[in-house]
Interface confidence: low
């Protein structure tokens, strides 16, 4: 009741503003999560205050709605192509300047923050939708929600609902921030067949950091973690005429690799990093398997390999290795070309002096913190000797240590090559940053994996043709299919393991279809047609930077129309709120930061939203007008 | 070379606040945590609390919530800490000092002593 | 919060001799690759000199004379040879959580 909630209100409110509910509720299926996060905040003051709505999504997130409701009154988030957004802040404000609410945070999260005037006893609630597709790694799914309300919260909740057509083998949901016996009290999870549930909707006592405070424990990540039952090798799903192709075969054996590891030892690895690198490098050379080859490279000024081919990874080589790891000492400049043309070298000499390694999985991981500045130093140049040095038949992974290194680059060679590239924090965990990038491509299962669909029924299509498979991931294939070729839809999948020729063919089910359709409706059709657009959006993006100008402007044009048509806030959209803006008649817009964008105070002052509906009219007296508030309240998931 | 440069000797009364700043420079000021640190005379190191001024994060030791503020001004390379309601106990040196990830607290202000006296 | 014992509290060391400070962490503060432990020297009426980071490596012109070992709950710092300027009290502190707590110090006076 109303007068139980003012009660209540008492202990919980900050400055006479409190939290009446903040919900997260994630619905995923077949991969494809979708989350609404809904905040109520109550101003009981008898003066306006500033409210800010703070919280943090995954950086592989697209927001796909954002609103605003006050005194009855809804402000909704408009999405259009950034040129056009981009003069309309223009005729806003004279500055050019925008005011963002998106900003990357960490390592892989985004902070979304807006700062808004609430009337005196006046309520506001917020509403912000982002989706994703959840990746398969190590062998699981993982949800994260970062949880950090500033305040104690009446109604707090975190819903999460899975379901997965070949049903769920294991679910598991931690709140690290919770001690465990308050973690075992407050999450309640289930699964049985297709369906998961987790819940975590702690009460105000629950939330308190101790029993007088009025300060919360809810600060950290919640993870749910999942993975489907995997008995049956094919995993096609169809609806709405877009399907999602799942392939993550179980029990292949593990391929013997032959790996090359180019390692920059330039002046700037001094200190932390080179100790990292080495303690990373020894442990995983103490993981490889005796079947793998494998060779170390150097690169500074100089090129040096340890061995200049590949040796087996017997205990002796492993331990030499080990000891040319400890000993090597820096060295000056950065001949990144020389490096990792050496490399390719060790590993392109399988097809002339080592026939029997050509059935192994080759892999080169380069390692670098900086710009090449020794021998060739042309980006373009470079990108072009390792491709035509590479020539398709290993991917090349690229790992780009700290800040000073041209990430984009890195990610442009890999991509050309096969690979992908990975940024290594420069952080206390480097090592196991780099023990974990490697433990992912430490167990390939099958190499040059083709999945094919009937040519005549497939209209749009997302990459279905990859280097290699590795143990714990997953590989996801979407399109679009044509009219009246549902039905007989089928996908051929031919790969090469270890010792044999991997072949299947998958075909759909469509009584088992129609069957998922009951029991999930629309939410199954609109996910399997979203993950489709994700995905192709995600591979336009990225292709985008490997190619000439004229390709890259029909690639973006493709990315911007999709973008579009399902909402999506990507590099290419922006997303502005009508009817609120700030003191400079700015409105807040919501735009996808660049992986390295500058904090919050680097893009211009905070800025204060107030809702035009809620503005003092210009008959009132200027001594009328109410002040902010010097404290800010936070409603803060970030 | 990195430095940092705290203001100088503070006298207050019992009841008063005080506060003191720790000014940066030669490295990036929003780039690395600023700590706080307080020693008391004859005594041991007793840590207050960090601000992050890229985004102005604050932690804070459970002790000295509601006893010490940290703020920073990015433009002025420059972090402070507002001790109030000040008791004869808040009499001490304070540091501030650099954090690193890699380098743990290796940097230091020479401190600023603040004695409360009536 | 972690508590960081330090023993002993204060140390007579003859010139050219050993001194060994032993730090205990109420929970361990390493990881199978580092350990969150620093030490730091301080002399009086000056701020802390950081001496070893996370655990056994060397700030960069501190002499070699200064080592430090250990992981998980136990850590020792050793100065050999002890010389004149040694004279100060050593502090071990934990990086491993907020908040970072440091031990007691111990107090080292030369012979």
């Known amino acids: 009741s109303k007068s139980s909630e003012k009660r209540q209100a008492v202990d919980t409110a900050v400055d006479g503003v409190f939290i009446r509910s903040l919900k997260v509720n994630c619905k995923v299926t077949s991969r494809f999560a979708h989350y609404v996060v809904t905040s109520q905040v109550v101003n009981t003051a008898n003066e306006a205050r500033e409210v800010a709505f703070d919280l943090e999504i995954p950086k592989t997130a697209f927001i796909s709605d954002f609103a605003v409701t006050a005194d009855g009154n809804a402000f909704i988030g408009d999405i259009k192509d950034k040129v056009t957004a981009w003069k309309q802040y223009r005729k806003a404000a004279i500055s050019g300047e925008n005011a963002g609410l998106v900003r990357a945070s960490g390592r892989t999260m985004e902070q979304f923050t807006i700062h808004l005037t609430v009337n005196p006893q006046s309520k506001v609630t917020f509403q912000l939708t982002y989706e994703e597709v959840l990746k398969r790694n190590h062998m699981q799914y993982e949800i994260v929600i970062k949880v950090k309300p500033k305040q104690l919260v009446h109604h707090f909740e975190i819903d999460v609902d899975i379901f997965e057509p070949q049903g769920i083998s294991k679910l598991d949901a931690q709140a690290s921030f919770l001690p465990k016996e308050l973690a075992a009290q407050t999450i309640k999870k289930s699964f049985s067949g297709k369906k998961g549930h987790v819940l975590f909707r702690p009460t105000v006592s629950q939330q308190q950091s101790c029993p007088t405070c009025s300060t919360s424990l809810l600060n950290g990540h919640f993870k749910v973690t999942y993975d489907v039952s995997r008995d049956k090798i094919c995993d096609l799903l169809v609806a709405n005429n877009h399907f999602a192709h799942f392939f993550a075969p179980q029990n292949l054996t593990n391929m013997n690799k032959n790996v090359v590891f180019v390692i920059d030892i330039s002046g700037s690895m001094r200190g932390q990093k080179v100790k990292q690198t080495k303690e990373a490098l020894l442990k995983i050379l103490g993981d490889m398997q005796p079947g793998d080859y494998f060779d170390l490279v150097l690169f500074g000024t100089r090129v040096q390999s340890w061995k200049g081919s590949l040796v087996q990874a017997s205990e002796a080589n492993l331990q030499a290795a080990q000891d040319f790891v400890r000993g090597f000492s820096l060295d000056e400049a950065t001949n990144l070309n020389g490096g990792l043309l050496r490399g390719i070298e060790i590993l392109n000499q399988v097809q002339e002096s080592l026939p029997e390694l050509s059935n192994h999985a080759s892999i080169l991981i380069m390692l670098t913190d900086g710009d090449p500045t020794e021998g060739v130093t042309d980006r373009s140049q470079i990108l072009k000797n390792v491709r035509n040095a590479i020539r398709g038949r290993f991917p090349l992974y690229n790992l780009g240590f700290g800040h000073n290194v041209d990430f984009n680059f890195l990610e442009v060679m890999s991509m050309e090559n096969n690979g992908r590239a990975q940024r290594i924090y420069e952080d206390h965990d480097a090592t196991q940053q780099l023990q974990g990038f490697y433990s992912q491509v430490a167990k390939p299962l099958l190499v040059d994996v083709d999945l094919q669909y009937p040519q005549d029924a497939v209209l749009a299509l997302t990459q279905n043709h990859h280097k290699q498979y590795y143990e714990g991931s997953e590989i996801v294939v979407a399109g679009r299919i044509a009219d009246n070729k549902q039905s007989s839809f089928k996908a051929d999948v031919q790969a090469h393991g270890e010792g044999q020729e991997f072949s299947i063919t998958c075909l759909v089910d469509e009584e088992e279809m129609k069957k998922l359709l009951r029991e999930r409706g629309h939410m199954l059709e609109n996910h399997v047609e979203r993950l489709w657009a994700y995905l192709t959006i995600q591979e336009l993006l990225a292709k985008r930077m490997k190619v000439d100008r004229e390709e890259r402007a029909n690639l973006s044009s493709q990315a911007l129309q999709m973008s579009l048509d399902y909402g999506f806030v990507t590099p290419l959209t922006s997303m502005s709120i009508r009817g609120m803006a700030d003191q400079d008649g700015l409105k807040p817009t919501i735009d996808k930061p660049s992986e390295d964008s500058p904090p919050l105070e680097m893009l211009g002052p905070r800025r204060t939203f107030v809702l035009s509906a809620l503005q003092p009219s210009p008959t009132h007296s200027s001594s009328n007008t109410q002040r902010l508030p010097d404290r800010v309240t936070g409603v803060d998931t970030d | 070379e990195v430095q940092l440069q705290q203001s100088g000797t503070v006298l207050a009364r019992p009841g008063a606040s005080v506060k003191m700043s720790c000014r940066a420079s030669?490295?990036?000021?929003?780039?690395?945590?600023m700590h706080w640190v307080k020693q008391r005379p004859g005594q041991g190191l007793e840590w207050i609390g960090s601000i992050y001024p890229g985004n102005t994060d604050t932690n804070y030791n459970q002790k000295f919530k509601g006893k010490a503020k940290l703020t920073a001004v990015t433009s002025a390379s420059t972090a402070y800490m507002e001790l109030s309601s000040l008791t004869n106990e808040d009499s001490a040196v304070y540091y501030c000092t650099r954090y690193g990830t890699s380098e743990g607290f290796a940097y230091w202000g020479q401190g600023t002593l603040v004695t409360v006296s009536a | 919060d972690i508590v960081m014992t330090q023993s002993p509290a204060s140390l007579a060391v003859s010139l050219g001799q050993r001194a060994t400070i032993s730090c205990r962490a109420s929970q361990s503060v390493s990881t199978s690759s580092y350990s969150y432990m620093h030490w730091y020297q301080q002399k009086p009426g000056q701020p802390p000199k950081l001496l070893i980071k996370y655990a056994s490596n060397l700030e960069s012109g501190v002499p070699a004379r200064f080592s430090g070992s250990g992981s998980g709950t136990d850590f020792t710092l050793n100065i050999h040879p002890v010389e004149e300027e040694d004279s100060a009290t050593y502090y071990c502190q934990h990086s491993w959580e907020i908040p970072p707590t440091f031990g007691g110090g111990t107090k080292l006076e030369i012979k």
């Open positions: 030669g490295y990036s000021f929003t780039s690395y945590w």
